[in-house]
C-alpha cells in the first residue's frame, strides 16, 4: 500500500471535501521541485520568489544577488544563462515554441561587471539556439539554420556554416524526427570540455517527404504548415558530424568526423556525441534497422588537423532479441583515464546493468547485476559512481540513488536514498555539482515531493530546498483517493498495476472501473510518484476505481517483457490490459457493466484496439491523439520496434495492427475520438482515417477536434478536453451531473 498525506480522524471527516474538476484544471494542488543550477562544485544559481537571480555558496553559507528582477523585467526575460567566467549573462525573451523541445527566442547579453547590456554586434533575432562555451565567454548560436561563433559577446560573429536552409539543411539544430525521436534536445552542437572545439551535426532533409496540414489562425485563408517528416519506410535525413577549432575557426574550417564503415554501408542514424577531452570525442551511430549500435572514439590529429576514428576504438552493441538499448541507446560516462567508460546495456540474463568497458565490449566488467535494472548513471568521480535503479524491495516503479565506491576493491555499494524518508519518498532523481561535491535529491513521491541538498562525501543532508509546505496544508482538508501498487502473476508474466481507489472505498461494494493506458515500448506507468490529477478527481469525487497496468513492452523489468512486443506492436500491450481487467473483476468490487478505458498518443492506440478487441469487457472508451496505423508514424520510432513496412520485412503486421482494420468491432462500444488539427507528432491524419473507417462501416461514434492544437492539447483546450471527457465518462457510467 502506498501512503498518501496523513489523514485526519473520522470526527473531522465532515470538514473534508472531495477533489473537484476545477481543482485539477486550476492546478490547485501542483507541487514544486528545486533543481539547483550548478555553476561550480559548491555554488548554484536560483531564481528567488521575487525573480532576482541569486548565487548560493554552500561552503561559505553566503548568497549573492547577481542580477536584479528589474534587469530581467527590462527585457521581459523568462530565462537566463551565466557565462562560465561570470562576466556575462544571456537573457532570453520572446519565447516562441516550435516542437517538443525546440523554440526560438530573442537574446540580450548583460555585462555583470559593469551592469550594462552589451551594445554593438547585438545578436540577430529570433535565434534558434544559443549557448556559452564551457570556459570563458565564447558564444555559439544558430540563426536561420546556420551556426555562428563569437569569441566575446561584443565581438562580430564568425559564420561557421553557410548552407542552412529552412526545412532543407539544419546545422547545429535537429530536424523534426531527430529532435523528437533520437536526440530529445533542441540542439545538435557540443562544445569540447575547455571550449577549444565545437562539434555539430548537419541534417540534410532535402529528400524527405513533407507532412502538410492547415493552421487556421484568424486570417481569411489558413496557413499550411510543412514539415519534413519521414514516416515508416520513407527516405530519412542524411546526417554528417563536423568539428571546428573555435580558437582559429577560419584556419582549416569544419572537419568532418568519419562514420564507421560497418555503419556507413547502409542507412544509418547518428545517436549522440560525448566529449571525453578537448582532443578526444565519442560518437554513437545506429543502423536504420536499430539492433546494431556502434560507439566510436575519435582523436584529434594535430599534424593533419583532422579527426581519426581507429577501428580499434569502435565498440559494437547488438541486440538479438529486440532493438539496441531501451528507449534510446545509452550514452557512455567516461572515467578519468579518458578511454574507459561506464555504460548501461543488457547483461546475459537480459537485464539492463552498468558495465565498465576498458578495451572491448566483450571484456566488459559488469558492475551491477540482479533481476532489476540500472536506469541512469548520474556521475562518475575518481572514487564513486552514482546511479539510479529499481532494485530496492523489488518494486520496478521505484527509483533510488546508489553510490558504488570504485576507488576500493571490491567495490562496495550503498543506497543513498532507500531509508531517508521511506514512506514519503520512493522515487528519486538527483542533480550533482562539479566533482559531485554536493548534490540535490528530488523526491517525486509517493508522498508530497521534497527536494534536499546533500554533501557529496558523506551523503549528509545539508538543508531542505523545497518541501511543498503550502501544498501539504492545502491538502489537509481534501479527501484524496487511496493508492496501491501491486502485481498480478499471469502465465509467467508479472503485471504490475496501480489502483486508485475512492476515499471511502469498500470492498463489498461495486465500483465503475476506468483503465488509463499508455503502454508504449519502454514506458512505465506504474510509478511510486505523487500526483493530484484528473484520475485523482474521478476517484475522489465521482467514485470511480482507476487502474494503470504495465504490460508487455514496458520498461525496467528485463528484456523478456520489454522485447516481447518487438515487430508486433498492438498485440500483447492490448492483451495484457484485457487480462488485468479480468483479474480486477475477479477481485469482486468492480461493476463489470461499467468498465472504460482511455489513453493518449500510444495510449490512444492501445485504448482503441482494446475497445475493438471484441471481448465485450468495455462499455466505453476514449482515444486522445491516437496512432491508428504505424505507416503514419515517424520512421525512427516506428522502425525501432516494427522493422520496415516492406513485403520482405514486416508489412503484414503493419497492415494487421491498424485501428481501421477493426472498425466493425466498435459497434458495441461508446467511442470518443479526440485529436488536435495541428498535431505535428501524431498527425490528425490518424484520427481522420479512424473516423473514415467508422463512417464507412456505419458505426456510430463521438468525436472532438481541437483546432490549431498540437499533440499536447494545451491552454484552454486542456480545460475543454477534461470537461468533455468527464461528461462522456459520467454518461457512460450513469453518474449524475
Amino acid at each position: 500500500i502506498v501512503l498518501r498525506p496523513s489523514r485526519v480522524h473520522n470526527s473531522e471527516e465532515n470538514t473534508m471535501r472531495a477533489l473537484t474538476l476545477k481543482d485539477i484544471l486550476n492546478g490547485t494542488f501542483s507541487y514544486k521541485t528545486f533543481f539547483p543550477n550548478w555553476i561550480s562544485g559548491q555554488e548554484y544559481l536560483h531564481q528567488s520568489a521575487d525573480n532576482n537571480i541569486v548565487l548560493y555558496n554552500i561552503e561559505t553559507g553566503q548568497s549573492y544577488t547577481i542580477l536584479s528582477n528589474r534587469t530581467m523585467k527590462s527585457v521581459n526575460a523568462s530565462n537566463y544563462g551565466l557565462s562560465p567566467d561570470r562576466q556575462f549573462v544571456y537573457l532570453e525573451s520572446d519565447y516562441s515554441k516550435l516542437w517538443r523541445y525546440s523554440y526560438t527566442a530573442t537574446y540580450y547579453i548583460y555585462d555583470l561587471s559593469n551592469g550594462e547590456f552589451v551594445r554593438g554586434n547585438e545578436l540577430p533575432r529570433p535565434i534558434q539556439y544559443l549557448c556559452w562555451s564551457p570556459v570563458g565567454s565564447k558564444l555559439a548560436y544558430v540563426y536561420q539554420n546556420n551556426i555562428y561563433l563569437k569569441q566575446r559577446p561584443g565581438d562580430p560573429p564568425f559564420q561557421i556554416t553557410f548552407n542552412g536552409r529552412e526545412n532543407k539543411i539544419f546545422n547545429g539544430i535537429p530536424d523534426w524526427v531527430y529532435e523528437e525521436e533520437m536526440l530529445a534536445t533542441k540542439y545538435a552542437l557540443w562544445w569540447s570540455p575547455n571550449g577549444k572545439f565545437l562539434a555539430y551535426a548537419e541534417f540534410n532533409d532535402t529528400d524527405i517527404p513533407v507532412i502538410a496540414y492547415s493552421y487556421y489562425g484568424d486570417e481569411q485563408y489558413p496557413r499550411t504548415i510543412n514539415i519534413p517528416y519521414p514516416k515508416a519506410g520513407a527516405k530519412n535525413p542524411v546526417v554528417r558530424i563536423f568539428i571546428i577549432d573555435t580558437t582559429y575557426p577560419a584556419y582549416v574550417g569544419p572537419q568532418e568526423v568519419p562514420v564507421p564503415a560497418m555503419i556507413a554501408s547502409s542507412d544509418y542514424y547518428f545517436s549522440w556525441l560525448t566529449w571525453v577531452t578537448d582532443e578526444r570525442v565519442c560518437l554513437q551511430w545506429l543502423k536504420r534497422v536499430q539492433n546494431v549500435s556502434v560507439l566510436s572514439i575519435c582523436d584529434f590529429r594535430e599534424d593533419w588537423q583532422t579527426w581519426d576514428c581507429p577501428k580499434t576504438q569502435e565498440h559494437i552493441e547488438e541486440s538479438r532479441t529486440g532493438w539496441a538499448g531501451g528507449f534510446f541507446v545509452s550514452t557512455p560516462v567516461f572515467s578519468y583515464d579518458a578511454i574507459s567508460y561506464y555504460k548501461i546495456f543488457s547483461d546475459k540474463d537480459g537485464y539492463k546493468h552498468i558495465h565498465y568497458i576498458k578495451d572491448t565490449v566483450e571484456n566488459a566488467i559488469q558492475i551491477t547485476s540482479g533481476k532489476w535494472e540500472a536506469i541512469n548513471i548520474f556521475r562518475v568521480t575518481q572514487d564513486s559512481l552514482f546511479y539510479s535503479s529499481n532494485e530496492f524491495e523489488e518494486y520496478p516503479g521505484r527509483r533510488n540513488i546508489y553510490r558504488i565506491s570504485i576507488g576500493s576493491y571490491p567495490p562496495s555499494k550503498k543506497c543513498v536514498t532507500c531509508h531517508l524518508r521511506k514512506e514519503r519518498c520512493q522515487y528519486y532523481t538527483a542533480s550533482f555539482s562539479d566533482y559531485a561535491k554536493y548534490y540535490a535529491l528530488v523526491c517525486y513521491g509517493p508522498g508530497i515531493p521534497i527536494s534536499t541538498l546533500h554533501d557529496g562525501r558523506t551523503d549528509q543532508e545539508i538543508k531542505i530546498l523545497e518541501e511543498n509546505k503550502e501544498l501539504e496544508n492545502a491538502l489537509k482538508n481534501i479527501q484524496l483517493p487511496k493508492e496501491e501498487i501491486k502485481k498480478l502473476e499471469v502465465d509467467e508474466i508479472t503485471l504490475w498495476y496501480k489502483m486508485i481507489l475512492p476515499p471511502q472505498f469498500d470492498r463489498s461494494k461495486k465500483y465503475p472501473l476506468l483503465i488509463q493506458v499508455y503502454g508504449g515500448p519502454c514506458s512505465q506507468s506504474v510509478r511510486s510518484v505523487f500526483a493530484v490529477n484528473w484520475i485523482s478527481y474521478l476517484a475522489s469525487k465521482e467514485g470511480m476505481v482507476i487502474a494503470l497496468v504495465d504490460g508487455r513492452g514496458t520498461a525496467f523489468q528485463g528484456d523478456k517483457l520489454l522485447y516481447a512486443v518487438y515487430r508486433k506492436l498492438g498485440v500483447y500491450e492490448v492483451e495484457d490490459q484485457i487480462t488485468a481487467v479480468r483479474k480486477f473483476i475477479e477481485m469482486g468490487f468492480i461493476d463489470e457493466k461499467r468498465i472504460a478505458i482511455w489513453g493518449w498518443s500510444y495510449g490512444g492506440y492501445v485504448s482503441s484496439l482494446a475497445l475493438a478487441s471484441g471481448t465485450g469487457l468495455f462499455k466505453c472508451g476514449i482515444a486522445v491523439a491516437p496512432v491508428s496505423s504505424w505507416e503514419y508514424y515517424a520512421s525512427v520510432y516506428t522502425e525501432r520496434f516494427m522493422g520496415l513496412p516492406t513485403k520482405d520485412d514486416n508489412l503484414e503486421h503493419y497492415k494487421n495492427s491498424t485501428v481501421m482494420a477493426r472498425a466493425e468491432y466498435f459497434r458495441n462500444v461508446d467511442y470518443l475520438l479526440i485529436h488536435g488539427t495541428a498535431d505535428d507528432n501524431v498527425h490528425f491524419q490518424n484520427s481522420a482515417q479512424i473516423a473514415k473507417a467508422l463512417v464507412n462501416a456505419q458505426v456510430d461514434f463521438q468525436a472532438m477536434w481541437y483546432s490549431d492544437q498540437n499533440h499536447g492539447l494545451s491552454g484552454l483546450s486542456t480545460n475543454h478536453l477534461y470537461t468533455h471527457m468527464t461528461h462522456f465518462l459520467k454518461q457512460c457510467f450513469s453518474l449524475s451531473d
Epitope: 561559505t60 549573492y64 544577488t65 542580477l67 561570470r86 551592469g115
Partner: antibody
C-alpha cells in the same frame, strides 16, 4: 567604465570622528557588496569591513580593530558608500580604499584612496 | 579569524628571472584565494583569483596554484614593470584577511 572615487579624508585628532565617502559609477552599485581596505604608511593592506547589497540583506562585517567604532553604510540612490569613523586612534592613520567585492570572491575594482591622519 | 602568512617578505630578482611567492592560510580556505599587485602610490590590482584564475588583461607570465592552505604565485620571466609589492588574500569568510606582503625589488 567602472570608477570608485573616495573623499572625506584629512587630519583629525585622536577621539575624533570622520566620514569617508566613495562614489561609484559604471556598474550596478545597488547589487554590489562594497568594502573598505586601509593601508597604514609603509605597511601592508588591512581589510576594514564590508556591506552587502540590500537585496542580500544589507548586513555588515568588520575587522576586530575597528568593530564598534566604525560603521559602513550605503545610499543606493546616490551610488555612494560611506565609512563613519568614531573614537579615532593614531593607529587608524592610513590611506583608505573602497573596493567592490565581486561575487567570484575578489576585490576587483579599487578607488585611488583617501588619506586619513589621526594626530594630536 | 583566518591568518595569512606570506613569504618571503622581500625578494631581490633580475629581469628574466623566475620568481615564486608563497602564502599559507591558518585553516583550509579551499580556493577562496587571490593575489594582488600594488605599486607605490597606487591602488592594488587584482592578478589571480580563485587561486589559479588569471584576471582578464593580466600577462600570462603570472600564474597561481594551490588549494586548501598552501598557495603559490609564480612569475615565469620577470619584466621591469613587475617590480612591486604582492599581497595574498583569503575570501573564504570575513574578515577577508591579507598577507603581510612581499616586496619584489630589482637586484
Amino acid at each position: 567604465e567602472v570608477q570608485l572615487v573616495e573623499s572625506g579624508g584629512g587630519l583629525v585628532k585622536p577621539g575624533g570622528s570622520l566620514r569617508l565617502s566613495c562614489v561609484a559609477s559604471g556598474f550596478t552599485f545597488s547589487l554590489a557588496w562594497m568594502n573598505w581596505v586601509r593601508q597604514a604608511p609603509g605597511k601592508g593592506l588591512e581589510w576594514v569591513g564590508h556591506i552587502k547589497s540590500r537585496a542580500d540583506g544589507g548586513s555588515t562585517d568588520y575587522a576586530a580593530p575597528v568593530k564598534g567604532r566604525f560603521t559602513i553604510s550605503r545610499d543606493d540612490s546616490k551610488n555612494t558608500l560611506y565609512l563613519h569613523m568614531n573614537s579615532l586612534k593614531t593607529e587608524d592613520t592610513a590611506v583608505y580604499f573602497c573596493s567592490r567585492f565581486y561575487w567570484n570572491y575578489v576585490l576587483d575594482y579599487w578607488g585611488q584612496g583617501t588619506l586619513v591622519t589621526v594626530s594630536s | 579569524d583566518i591568518q595569512m602568512t606570506q613569504s618571503p617578505s622581500s625578494l631581490s630578482a633580475s629581469v628574466g628571472d623566475r620568481v615564486t611567492i608563497t602564502c599559507r592560510a591558518s585553516q583550509s580556505i579551499n580556493s577562496y584565494f587571490n593575489w594582488y599587485q600594488q605599486k607605490p602610490g597606487k591602488a592594488p590590482k587584482l592578478l589571480i583569483y580563485a587561486a589559479s584564475g588569471l584576471q582578464s588583461g593580466v600577462p600570462s607570465r603570472f600564474s597561481g596554484s594551490g588549494s586548501g592552505t598552501d598557495f603559490t604565485l609564480t612569475i615565469s620571466s620577470l619584466q621591469p614593470e613587475d617590480f612591486a609589492t604582492y599581497y595574498c588574500q583569503q575570501s573564504y569568510s570575513p574578515p577577508y584577511t591579507f598577507g603581510q606582503g612581499t616586496n619584489l625589488e630589482i637586484k
